[in-house]
């Protein structure tokens, strides 16, 4: 069985302020089991944008229905983009662990740039 890969097809995405940004991410396998998370930035200071397991992320919607048991699409849409949202977004697969899940594999990242709102 091939090892899971995390595919973020776009290196960069440009969105006008006030619009929604779609950040695409797909897995090549459902195994190992464990949640998907999205982060802005990398390293210790990265910001959690979305956690499949839990939490309230009012500006984030998932493009696919994550409750499908065979779902491999973990793309997200972030609404009402502002310049403060600019940065590189990483789709990260975790494998289950106890007490904490373990980071398994990250996508290559998608850089979000924000254009000025058209006048």
């Amino acid at each position: 069985e091939d090892e899971l890969q995390v595919i973020q097809p776009e290196k960069s995405v440009s969105v006008a302020a006030g619009e929604s940004a779609t950040l695409r991410c797909a897995m090549t396998s459902l195994i190992p089991v464990g949640p998907i998370m999205w982060f802005r930035g990398a390293g210790a200071g990265r910001e959690l944008i979305y956690n499949q397991k839990e939490g309230h992320f009012p500006r984030v919607t998932t493009v696919s229905e994550l409750t499908k048991r065979n779902n491999l699409d973990f793309s997200i849409s972030i609404s009402n983009i502002t310049p403060a949202d600019a940065g590189t977004y990483y789709c990260v697969k975790f494998r289950k662990g106890s007490p904490d899940d373990v980071e398994f594999k990250s996508g290559a990242g998608t850089e979000l740039s924000v254009r000025a709102k058209p006048s």
């Epitope: 089991v33 048991r69 289950k96």
Partner: antibody, heavy 118, light 107 residues
Amino acid sequence: DVQLVESGGGVVRPGESLRLSCAASGFTFSSYAMSWVRQAPGKGLEWLAGISAGGSDTYYIDSVKGRFTISRDNSKNSLYLQMNSLTAEDTAVYYCARETWNHLFDYWGLGTLVTVSS
Amino acid sequence: ALTQPASVSANPGETVKITCSGGDYYSTYYGWYQQKSPGSAPVTVIHSDDKRPSDIPSRFSGSASGSAATLTITGVRVEDEAVYFCGAYDGRTYINTFGAGTTLTVL
């Protein structure tokens, strides 16, 4: 509080059909996958079927595939199980259950009893 | 198939461990379900291997390693007498399965 209330159970003859319902309240029903689980008298739990939050994807154990159909109406906060060609082996208490993000169960209904007897 | 002992017994205050084997660690999540009488509604005491719902006492804990999961009740009480079913979700097959149940008797 999360509440799941099953209804529609009863006594039927072999070969007949029955439709079970599960009324959900206390949570955003349309955001959760749901399942049906049954327990035959003196036996353990048996998962039967699951359905995604939007209702587009369904999953079944082999023994009920083709006979049972799981469905939902998110506008009515309701889950259903259509059971056809019933046999004595389908006699059980039927529970609806809310799924967690990883398809285990966190809340269960009180159950409804289905008896198949001639 | 998930395998668990048919019965366990303990005195009040003791620690009880119930094991459940049969799943592959990398494709399986486990849960534990308490049923106090046949035909009564099950109660989830553990899901996602080790996650305890907020209304479940802290004496219940869960773990998983290798091909097995364990439910631990630390300081068991008389009201914990019940049948405990382990359950699993397999990400390879998309199927849920249950063990046959373990009857816990508190002496």
